[in-house]
């Protein structure tokens, strides 16, 4: 069955309880288009987003009878001049016979006569049609025969793509059968089909077809009123393109629509090869598309690579939204021409800033007031990250200009960054020098505190993605973040006490769920001590509120629960509820405080795993007093686990071993070269995983990767001398929790050569190890005490610089 | 072919106005635009705005906006600019060009000489 | 004073090739196309180049444009007496919102 055999069979279901082989049809109010009912139009009630009324006619083929209901009746079959008289096609049928056609349509053959409606005759210009009327044994005869086919085509033969030779010199007939049920010749309706004659069939259509012998170049090249648009096409290498074999559509601006186009946007595009090629290849579609094919909206792809949706008003074609077709269906050779009164601009074609629609005016003005605009060069390549209209408050608006420029300076990135470029974990450098991070989620994206939302665009010069909220990069740690906010005074002196400072003040990535003083609410001092003397107990609680990962509340997928792993093993449960976060089914007071090494969401109570049962009757006396929301168990004796310390902390042990320095005399001053190991240096981080393993169970973790040398001088009690750090990445057995980055870096005397080689190849996986940066060195004191044998209490930061060359293999690095 | 015609040289005092016609031949006026360009005496071409042949709209260069002002005559195929309160360093030679955008400028009139004397 | 800046001069002789240099900034030809005008003694000018290379036509192909960042340059090859005028280039300036023409080069033929 074809589209329009199908939609003929709705308009039967629609149409049969007014009685047998009768047809739903859909007439556009205040026109005379009528449509056989599709199904997305029948419940609309609409076709081109115009009312309806629904007329009942006798299908195709069927007539009424007096006194019956429907349409029970057969239509009599005749040949195929008899059938224009049958289907009402009466103007063609005396067309037919002025033009001594009628007996050719009488006698023997078989023929398919696409037969124009009398109100398409009417409809024809009337130059045109006098001149016809004037030469009908001709010009008349031509003109009909162009409208025939030398054999029955039924709308089931009428494939969509199809070019059919006409009666009339082979002149094509351009077949299109569109989904929606229409099917056009060169571009006119098939407003009633498949009128089966004795010797063919006849189809009626909505306009009198025009002869073509003409491409779209052609076409192009002869009317003035596109010599902007030849002219461009020619700027564009296109012209000659539009001259091929094909079925095209080309929506072609006029010279007004030219002169439309800001003029400094025409100059630039006009410039640029890319943009100007991209600009003319976004008017062009592959396909042939027949305005009356359009009763709804729909996207193509254009030439470009990119869709424009195409949809209509009444007897107006829009484009992207917008009518602008002045001009429909001009048939030429090898598709079909609308003449329309804007440009249309592809984002491709688009400067980065031009890129912003009506919901991020905010943004782009202020870029523009705050002399931003000027540091997008046409020659760079940016990023807008641009919050939409309402992230900007009145207070924010209203801050000191240098202020609100260091903000904006905060939305703009140096490269251009598209959205299939963003990766959870990624750091990209904004024009004011900031760095900002990625947390790519199931169903958000989000830079730093504010997730996008939906309208990315990549345009000539740059992309751009809209944010909710105005990106904030976070200035302090976690710890920091605490420690400065009196609500969190009790939390913080816990966590101290848990010895777990460390852990919130050093780099990484955490989601803390910080409970506030309210949480403690009742706790004596006593009781404090209860919890506090409990070690074990208070690290348990403590890191259930921590989770590895930066979770944003916005990226949390909405309306469902989501499963996180916290650092003490058991689960914690987030929910996403009209802009609050429900963590165990509690509310968050206050969500996506950004941290440098994570996020804090407050809550004001104290979170438990309830999976974990206490056995100390005292504690269980002040969690019960603390935690109303769970009933938490109880088995006596039971004690909780000891959480190792490797899973959250990062142990550094330091030998140094006094070097061999042997002294090579120069010309200007002696070069020092070292021999032997100069330092070791065994360095163990770890992180959590997920996954907690049980006693007994071991596990073997292979990470990957090859050995890693770092060479560089330090300076030791005045000494210069030469280290290299061996990063080397090898399986290991761990039991207990499971460490997800084991690092080992040992130092060792590698030829500059092997340096130079390493380097070369491992260049992107260097990372820094040693804290403290550049030429981090130890008090003398301290060197000394290790010389003697004993451990240094701590590292001690550098005061004196990495000398000479060799500092520029450091900084040469990756950080 | 294309053909602009300038009305004929002019001499102004300074403070009085001068308006220049272009009658366009050869194409479809409405079509294409007409910008105007000016050249003082060994000088260089400095452009003084745009008129629409289509509709009307204008664009002016900032220099000489609310002293200047272009209109057409889509009956007769005819371009005017008029200047305003003149000053001696007006007096140039005042060329009309077609100017259809895409392509910039690319037929011109003979050139009017205004002369601008007390 | 002209935005664009070029060369007063330049010369070569007959059936040589001689280059007409456009210098501008980010704003006109960092920006947007250049185009070429030839305005022989005593008449009106004359489009030569469009779009930084496009040739309208008429114009031989002895003319040849090119763009690059905020400069642009014209190049005579075959050089001919016709060809003594004077050649202004000419961006749109985004800042002034302007159509800026160079201050002119005059080409003589030796």
């Known amino acids: 069955n074809s589209y329009y055999d199908k939609v003929l069979a709705h308009s039967r279901i629609r149409g049969r309880d007014q009685g047998p082989n009768v047809c739903a049809l859909q007439q556009i109010l205040g026109t005379k288009k009528k449509y056989f009912s599709s199904c997305k139009n029948w419940y609309q009630g609409a076709i081109c987003g115009k009312k309806t009324t629904v007329l009942y006619e006798c299908c195709p083929g069927y007539m009424r009878m007096e006194g019956m209901k429907g349409c029970p009746a057969v239509m009599p079959i005749d040949h195929v001049y008899g059938t224009l008289g049958i289907v009402g096609a009466t103007t063609t049928q005396h067309y037919s016979d002025v033009s001594k056609l009628r007996e050719e349509i009488e006698g023997k053959g078989s023929y398919t006569y696409f037969a124009p409606s009398n109100e398409a005759w009417d409809n024809l210009d009337s130059d045109i049609r006098r001149g016809l009327e004037n030469n009908v044994n001709v010009e008349l005869l031509n003109a009909l025969h162009s409208h025939m086919v030398n054999k029955r085509m039924l709308t089931k033969d009428l494939k969509h793509g199809m070019v059919i030779p006409s009666m009339y010199n082979n002149l094509g007939l351009f077949i299109n059968h569109y989904p929606n049920g229409v099917v056009t010749v060169n571009c006119a309706r098939v407003i009633h089909g498949n009128q089966i004659a004795t010797n063919g069939v006849v189809h009626v259509i909505d306009r009198v077809l025009t002869q073509i012998g003409t491409s779209i170049q052609d076409f192009i090249e002869a009317e003035d009123e596109l010599s902007s648009f030849r002219a461009a096409a020619i700027t564009s290498d296109l012209l000659e393109s539009l001259g091929r074999d094909g079925h095209f559509t080309l929506f072609a601006p006029t010279n007004e629509a030219f002169e439309k186009l800001p003029r400094g946007v025409l100059e630039r595009i006009m410039g640029d090869k890319v943009a100007s090629e991209a600009l003319m290849k976004y008017h062009i579609l592959n396909t042939l598309q027949c305005s009356e094919a359009i009763t709804g909206g729909a996207v193509f792809e254009t030439m470009e690579g990119n869709t424009i949706e195409i949809g209509c008003e009444g007897d107006s074609i829009s484009i992207n939204g917008i009518k602008m077709v002045n001009k429909k269906d001009i048939v030429t050779k090898n598709g079909v021409i609308h003449l329309i009164d804007e440009v249309l601009i592809p984002d491709s074609a688009k400067q980065v800033i031009e890129l912003a629609g009506k919901q991020q005016t905010t943004f782009t003005d202020l870029v523009a007031q705050l002399g931003l605009a000027s540091s997008l060069k046409p020659d760079g390549e940016y990023t807008l990250l641009a919050p939409v209209n309402n992230a900007f408050s009145d207070d924010t608006l209203s801050m000191d200009q240098r202020l609100l420029k260091l903000i904006l300076q905060n939305h703009i990135l140096k490269v251009k960054v598209g959205l299939s470029d963003l990766y959870n974990g990624q750091i990209l450098e904004t024009i004011g020098g900031k760095q900002l991070r990625v947390f790519v989620y199931r169903t958000a994206i989000c830079i730093e505190n504010s997730c996008m939302v939906r309208g990315s665009k990549q345009g000539r010069n740059g992309a751009i993605h809209i944010f909710r909220e105005i990106i904030q990069p976070a200035e302090k740690s976690l710890h920091e973040k605490l420690r400065q906010d009196k609500r969190f005074s009790i939390f913080l002196s816990l966590l101290e006490a848990a010895d777990l400072k460390d852990l919130l003040t050093q780099p990484g990535d955490w989601t803390l769920f910080a409970p506030t003083n309210d949480a403690f609410k009742g706790m004596t001092n006593e009781e404090r001590e209860i919890l506090i003397g409990d070690k074990n107990a208070l690290q348990n609680i403590i890191l259930y509120h921590l989770t590895p990962g930066v979770y944003i509340g916005k990226g949390f997928e909405p309306g469902v629960t989501n499963i996180l792993k916290t650092t003490q093993g058991s689960k914690i449960y987030v929910k996403g509820v009209n802009e609050t976060l429900l963590v165990n089914e509690l509310k968050s007071k206050e969500s996506d405080i950004m941290t440098t090494n994570g996020v804090i969401h407050v809550v004001d109570k104290l979170l438990y795993p309830a999976d974990i049962p206490v056995g100390n009757d005292q504690l269980l006396e002040l969690l019960n007093k603390l935690i109303k929301y769970i009933q938490i168990k109880f088995v006596r004796g039971s004690t909780f686990k000891e959480i190792p310390m490797t899973v959250y902390t990062t142990k550094i042990i330091t030998k140094l071993v006094e070097p061999k320095i042997k002294v090579i005399q120069g010309s200007l001053q002696p070069i020092i070269k070292t021999e032997g190991p100069a330092m070791t240096k065994i360095h163990i981080e770890g992180e959590p995983d997920f996954r907690l393993i049980k006693e007994g169970e071991t596990v073997t973790e292979v990470i990957h990767g090859e050995p890693v040398i770092k060479k560089y001088t330090k300076i030791i009690d005045g000494v210069p001398v030469e280290i290299t750090e061996k990063e080397t990445r090898e399986e290991r057995i761990i039991t207990g929790p499971e460490i997800k980055y084991t690092r080992i870096s040992t130092g060792g005397g590698e030829t500059e050569e092997t340096l130079q080689k390493f380097l070369q190849k491992e260049v992107s996986k260097v990372t820094k190890f040693i804290e403290g940066g550049d030429g981090h060195l130890f008090e003398d004191e301290a060197i000394k005490r290790l010389l003697q044998g004993d451990t240094p209490a701590k590292k001690i930061q550098a005061n004196k610089r990495v000398q000479g060359s060799r500092r520029r293999s450091r900084e040469g690095r990756s950080q | 072919q294309v053909q602009l015609v300038q009305s004929g040289a002019e001499v102004k005092k300074p403070g009085a106005s001068v308006k220049v016609s272009c009658k366009a031949s050869g194409y479809t006026f409405t079509s294409y635009g007409i910008s105007w360009v000016r050249q003082a005496p060994g000088q260089g071409l400095e452009w003084m705005g745009w008129i629409s042949a289509y509709n009307g709209n204008t664009n002016y260069a900032q220099k000489l906006q609310g002293r200047v002002t272009m209109t057409t005559d889509t009956s007769t195929s005819t371009a005017y600019m008029e200047l305003r309160s003149l000053r001696s360093d007006d007096t140039a030679v005042y060329y009309c060009a077609r100017d259809m955008l895409v392509v910039p400028f690319d037929y011109w009139g003979q050139g009017t000489l205004v002369t601008v004397s007390s | 004073q002209s935005v664009l800046t070029q060369s007063s001069s330049a010369s070569g002789t007959p059936g040589q090739t001689v280059t007409v240099s456009c210098s501008g900034s980010?704003?006109?030809?960092?920006?947007?196309?250049v185009n070429w005008y030839q305005q022989l003694p005593g008449t009106a000018p004359k489009l030569l180049i469009y779009s930084n290379d496009q040739r309208p036509s008429g114009v031989p192909d002895r003319f040849s444009g090119s763009k690059s960042g905020t400069s642009a340059s014209l190049a005579i090859s075959g050089l001919q007496s016709a060809d003594e005028a004077d050649y202004y280039c000419a961006a749109w300036d985004d800042s002034l919102s302007t159509y800026v023409f160079g201050s002119g080069t005059k080409v003589t033929v030796l």
């Open positions: 980010s704003s006109d030809i960092g920006s947007n196309r």
